[in-house]
Structure formats: C-alpha cells, structure tokens
C-alpha cells in the first residue's frame, strides 16, 4: 500500500495505525495516500518540522496517550484537508503559536488530558471552521479574554478538569453557535453575570464539582435553547428567584451536593420538559405547597440525604407525571395524609432512614401504581389496617429494621405480609422489637396465639378494608415478581463510564446502580 | 377459646350446590385468614381457597365452582360449591390462619343419585 | 403447582423410639430466608391438627417430642420419643405459594 512503515499496519480505506512502545519518532514513510493516521501508545517525545509533509489528503489524524512533550510550530504543514486532529493523553504544558496555522478545513481540535499550563488567543485564530475543542484535563488556571473569539463557528467547547478560578464575563461572548459547554471540575467560585449571554444556542451546560456559591439572577436568562444544566457538588446556598424562569427546553437539571437550606414555590420553571430532578445531598429542612407545580412532566424526583423533618400537604401539586420519589435518609416523623395524593403515576417511593413513627391509613390512597416502597429503618410500631390493600402492583415492601410492636394489632400487616409474600421481594423479614417476650423474632411467625392482646388506643386511622389482591388473571396466583427496576443516577453523558460503581440501597439514594455526576 | 364450628352433614344430587358454614368464637374473627381443606374418604387434603378481609383466593382446580363469602355480624364464613359430581364427596373442613392452627370438626357431603 | 412428596407412605416405630418422616417439594419453599414448610397430624374421625410451621416453629401445645428440620426442598418431621398418643397420619404442607399444597401422608404405627 504504496509503502507502509513495519511498525505500522495499512488497511485499504487508507487507514493507518502505528502503535508500541519501541516507536520514538513519526514512522517513514507513510503512504501518501493514507487519509486516517493514529499514532498511540509510543514513546514519541517531539514532533519534529513537517513529518506529515507527503501525506496531504491526510483527514484525520490521531496522536494519543504517547509522551509528547514538544511540538515545534510547523509541525502540521500542509495539512489543508485535515477535519480532526487528536493531541489527547499526551505531556504536552505549552503549545507553540502558529501550530495550527493552515489547518484551515480542521473542525474538531482535542488537546485534553495534557498539561497545558495556558492557551491564548493567538492559538486558535486561525481555526476559524473549528467546530469542537477539547481542553478538559488540563492545569489552565485562567481563560483570557479573545481567545476564542474567531471560533464563530464552534459548537462544543469543553473545559473541564482544570484549575480555572473565575470567567471573565467576555470569554464566551462571540460563541453564538455554541451548543455544548463545559466548565466542571474546575476552582470556579462565582460566574460573573452575562457571562453566558451570547450563547444563545446552548443546549449543555456543566458547571458540576466547582465552588460555586452564588448564581446570578439573571445568569441564564438569555439560554432560552438550554436543555441540560448540571450545578450539582457547588455550594449554593441559595436560589433566586428568578434563576430559573427562562429555561422552556430544560429537561435535566442537577443540583445535589450543593448547601441549599430552602427552596421557595415557583423557584422551579415554568419547565414543561423537565424530567429528572436531583436534589440531593443537601441542607433542605422543609418543602412548602406548590414548589414544584411548574414540573408538569418531571418523572424523577430526588430529595433524599436532606434534613428535610415537614412536607406541607401541597408540596407535591402539579407532579402528575412521577414516577420516582426519593425523600430517603431525611428527618421526617410525621407525614400528612394526602401529601402524595396527586402522584397518580409514582412507581417508586422510597422512605427509608427516616424518623416515621407512624403513618396515615390514606398515604397511598391515590397512588394506585405503587410498585416499590421502602420505609426500612424508621420508627415504625404498626402500619395502619388496609394501608396496602389497593396497590395491586406492588412488588418491593421493605419494613426491615423498624420497632415493630407484636400485639395482636400486628396481625393484619402480618397476614398481608404472609398472603402477599410471591409478590414482594425476598428482603430482610420484619423483626419483632416488643413486647419483650417476642423481640428477635420474626414479624411473620410470632405464635398468634401469645401474641400480647392491645391494650392502647390506636394511633392512625384505618380506612375501609379492600380486597388486596384481586383475585383475577392479571396477578396470577404463582407468579413471584422479581424486584422493579431501580433508578440510576443522573449520567452527564461525557463522563467516563468507569466511574460507575454499585451501590447498596442503603446507600446514596436507596437505589441499586449509581453512575457518579 | 378458639373455636370453629361447621354446619352439618349434607347429601347432594349431581349437578347441584351445597353451602357449608363455618361459625368462629373466641377471637377477632376480623383478623385472619380461613381456609377451606376438603379430604376425600381414605384420601389426603386438598386446598380449596381462602378468605380474607373480603378478598379471596382459590385454588384453579375450583375457580369458578367454588364461592366464598363471610358475614362478620355473625362471625362466619360460607363455602359454596356448585355443579356437584360424586368426585367431590368429601369432608370439608374451615381452617383459620395463614398456618391453618385451628380446624373445625368437618361437614361430610356426600354427591350421589 | 408445588408438589410435595413424602416418605415413608408407613412407618412402623416401637413406643419411645425415634420416628422420623421426610417430605421434599418440587421447588425451593424459602422465602424471606424463611421455610414456609408445616406439619400436620391427624387422628382416624378427626380434622388436622398444626404440629410445626415455618418448618421449626411448634404450634400451641405441641409436646416437646415433635421438632421440625430443613430447608429449601428438603424437610423432616421428627417424633423423639414415639408414644401411643402419637399413631396418627402426618402431613406436611407447603404455604409458600397458592395453591397451597399437601403431601401424600405417612401413616405411623406401632411396632
């Protein structure tokens, strides 16, 4: 294939690969013809003036994970055809100015995970077609103003991974075609108002895992295509109210591991997209009416790891369309009786590692889909009669480490317990806590006939007994169903899938897979 | 104490229906289950069904033959079974709880022409 | 269904000997990490009487003489010390799933 160098393999579409270790310079000679060439896992050190020279209808070109440390400025001449070029996972701290002069068809440009200590705005003046430019993983501790002003043209930029401070609020300001930006895991302590002004075609904006304290009211206004927007790991403490009122396409929006103490009703939309709502691993101690009634069409509702000890009845009107609600690892005792009565569509509930001592017979009244509870580790004595009889998809009940009083009062939770056992999974049996002579034992085969007869006035209120599980072919009598598909966390879609890892569900949000954010 | 008391013998043309019932005392007759068990002469037992808190649930062998229902007034639970054939001559016994601790003495029904 | 299947169908024992009589169920009767595994005793012209549920528990009144044993598929009723009170049919019975069902019976004499 019109010479292809030994340490190298040549395939017919032109495509070149030269890989190992015992590589220490550009391989010669390269076929003139070859349209792809990557060059990974060697010792390469420099690239030298022109060792592309022979190769110009060169497209693509790929110098990764080897330890380049210097590029002299005419190391790409005559390279006109080139769209892609690759200087990822490299050793490279300073980019000679010039080097990419006369790339003039080039359009994604990837230099992360070097050590590039800065960039100005003379490195990317001449790339005025570049589409993409990756810098994230780098030690860039300051962005200056111009340097990207003639990439009008860009549409995803993403600079995370460094060790940036602060924007400057005309950094951005000629990225007009803009759709994707990324900012996260950097020092940033506060974005200077108008700083995203000019991105009005935004679409992704990651600003997770920074120092980020306060938002700017206005910060977002002018984003009306925004679609994706991750604060989570910042220490917001607070939300004005206006943050988020000009965000239509929002559909994912991630605010865990921030400080939040409150959230005000109205704080969220109007957001008619909105999805998925991460909340937690934050300071937040009560929910009032109506906070999220703007999210018609949230389907994921995360508050667990909160403070949260009051729920007002309202709190969750508008939601009609959840599916998931996590308010586990919080400081509730009480709840009121029709706090989820407008989750008509709620699968998932989980409650647990809470302080609830007891619960309305109505809790679940409205919430006919119910396919999961969780209510483990709480303060639990009894449930009320009925309180599970109507949800005929139940398939998860965990009630597993909860003072249980094993009076005759817990016969019908226990007999539902029994006579619904091929529908629930097969947890940790609910323990006996007293009285005294049945501690230790299991819920389920106490000796009914020592069981302490009640002597108290009974806490809750039942509701009417209903047939718990209807005798009709859609429950068939042998069918076991296994556990529901549990939630995952929110995946920022660039992160490295080795990050994810399985979590027990008494961990981060009582779910069994997590990918970090 | 805790007692089951069934109703008494019954003889059946084939074809018709018998209602056996099962009268309870001495607990909360609203807080558990009672099974019917039927044992053919010289045979082993048979689960029927169940009734609880007015849901039910049979055995698919007798799904639509057999019925039933209880009157907490009185604090006893009916067994119906129609379309009778000389195959289900048996004793019929009530049992109470998920783990059947306490049985009523039988009702003999017997399906002849 | 879940069949349960015991053995021996007849058991002869000499009074204040060990009886031992096993059942076996088609599928796995653990649920919870429990056995949903019980036995029954039963006396010519007499219902049936709850000797041992959730395969270990014994129901009230039960002498000590009767234990239960097992796991999973594999159950055994033991009588420790036979006495003339005890010649009667014995039938386990799973109540993991409906329909809920019985064994055969193992008819025990005396020797």
């Known amino acids: 294939y019109h010479g292809c160098p030994s340490e190298c393999t040549c395939s017919r579409a032109s495509q070149v690969e030269c890989t190992g270790a015992r590589i220490v310079a550009v391989p010669t000679p390269l076929p003139w013809n070859a349209m792809s060439l990557q060059i990974l896992n060697t010792h390469i050190t420099e690239l030298n003036e022109s060792p592309f020279l022979n190769i110009s209808a060169l497209i693509a070109l790929r110098i990764e994970k080897n330890e380049l440390s210097r590029i002299t400025p005419g190391a790409f001449r005559n390279l006109g055809s080139l769209r892609y070029l690759s200087l990822a996972n490299n050793k490279l701290q300073v980019l000679p100015i010039g080097l990419f002069q006369g790339l003039d068809s080039l359009e994604s440009l990837l230099l992360s995970s070097n050590q590039l200590l800065q960039i100005q705005p003379a490195h990317f003046s001449q790339c005025s077609n570049l589409k993409e430019l990756q810098l994230h993983g780098n030690h860039l501790e300051y962005i200056p103003d111009g340097a990207f002003d003639h990439l009008v043209g860009l549409t995803k930029l993403n600079l995370g991974k460094n060790s940036l401070t602060h924007i400057s609020p005309r950094v951005f300001q000629h990225l007009g075609n803009l759709q994707v930006l990324r900012l996260y895991e950097n020092r940033l302590t506060d974005i200077p108002m108008g700083t995203f002004d000019g991105l009005v075609n935004l679409q992704e904006l990651a600003l997770q895992q920074n120092q980020i304290g306060l938002l700017s009211p206005g910060l977002f206004h002018n984003n009306h295509n925004l679609q994706r927007l991750y604060l989570s790991n910042n220490h917001i403490s607070q939300l004005p109210p206006s943050v988020f009122m000009q965000l239509p396409q929002l559909n994912r929006l991630t605010l865990f591991g921030n400080s939040l103490k409150e959230l005000s009703p109205g704080i969220f939309g109007p957001m008619p997209n909105l999805r998925e709502l991460w909340l937690y691993d934050n300071h937040i101690s009560s929910l009032p009416d109506n906070v999220f009634s703007n999210l018609r069409q949230l389907q994921v509702l995360i508050l667990s790891r909160n403070q949260i000890s009051f729920i007002s009845p309202g709190a969750f009107n508008g939601l009609t369309e959840l599916r998931e609600l996590s308010l586990h690892t919080n400081a509730l005792q009480d709840l009121d009786g029709n706090v989820f009565r407008m989750l008509a569509n709620l699968q998932n509930i989980s409650l647990q590692n809470n302080r609830l001592r007891q619960l309305p017979g109505n809790i679940f009244a409205n919430v006919n889909g119910l396919m999961a509870i969780q209510l483990q580790n709480n303060q639990l004595e009894n449930l009320p009669l009925g309180i599970f009889d109507h949800l005929g998809k139940l398939c998860e009940l965990r009630l597993y480490d909860n003072p249980w009083r094993c009076d005759s009062d817990i016969l019908p939770l226990r007999n539902w317990l029994l006579l619904n056992q091929p529908r629930l999974g097969t947890d940790t049996v609910p323990v006996c806590f007293s009285p005294a002579n049945v501690r230790g034992q299991s819920l389920i085969i106490i000796n009914v006939n020592v069981a302490v007869p009640s002597v108290h006035v009974p806490e809750v209120p039942s509701y009417p007994e209903t047939p718990w599980y209807p005798d009709t072919p859609s429950y068939p009598d042998t069918t076991s169903v296994s556990s529901t598909t549990e939630l995952t966390s929110p995946v920022e879609d660039y992160t490295d899938l080795t990050t994810i890892q399985v979590t027990d569900d008494r961990s981060v949000w009582g779910m069994t897979q997590a990918q970090s954010g | 104490q805790v007692q089951l008391v069934q109703s008494g013998a019954e003889v059946k043309k084939p074809g018709a229906s018998v209602k056996v019932s099962c009268k309870a005392s001495g607990y909360t007759f609203t807080s558990f289950v009672i099974h019917w068990v039927r044992q053919a002469p010289g045979q082993g037992l048979e689960w029927m069904g169940y009734i609880y808190n007015d849901g039910t649930k049979y055995n698919e062998r007798f799904r639509g033959r057999a019925t039933l229902t209880r009157d907490t007034s009185t604090s006893t639970v009916y067994m119906e079974l129609s379309s009778l054939r000389s195959e289900d001559t048996a004793v019929y016994y009530c049992a109470r709880d998920y783990y059947f601790d306490y049985w009523g003495q039988g009702t003999l029904v017997t399906v002849s022409s | 269904d879940i069949v349960m299947t015991q053995s021996p169908d007849s058991l002869a024992v000499s009074l204040g000997e060990r009886a031992t009589i096993n059942c076996r169920a088609s599928?796995?009767?653990?649920?919870?990490?429990?056995?949903?595994m019980n036995w029954y005793q039963q006396k010519p012209g007499q219902p049936p009487k709850l000797l041992i549920y959730?395969?270990?528990n014994q129901g009230s009144g039960v002498p000590d003489r009767f234990s239960g044993s097992g796991s999973g598929t594999d159950f055994t009723l033991t009588i420790s010390s036979l006495q003339a009170e005890d010649v009667a049919v014995y039938y386990c019975?799973?109540?993991?799933?409906?329909?809920?069902?019985f064994g055969g019976g193992t008819k025990v004499e005396i020797k």
């Open positions: 959730a395969a270990s």
């Open positions: 019975q799973q109540s993991k799933e409906v329909p809920y069902t």
């Open positions: 599928e796995s009767v653990d649920y919870y990490g429990i056995s949903f």
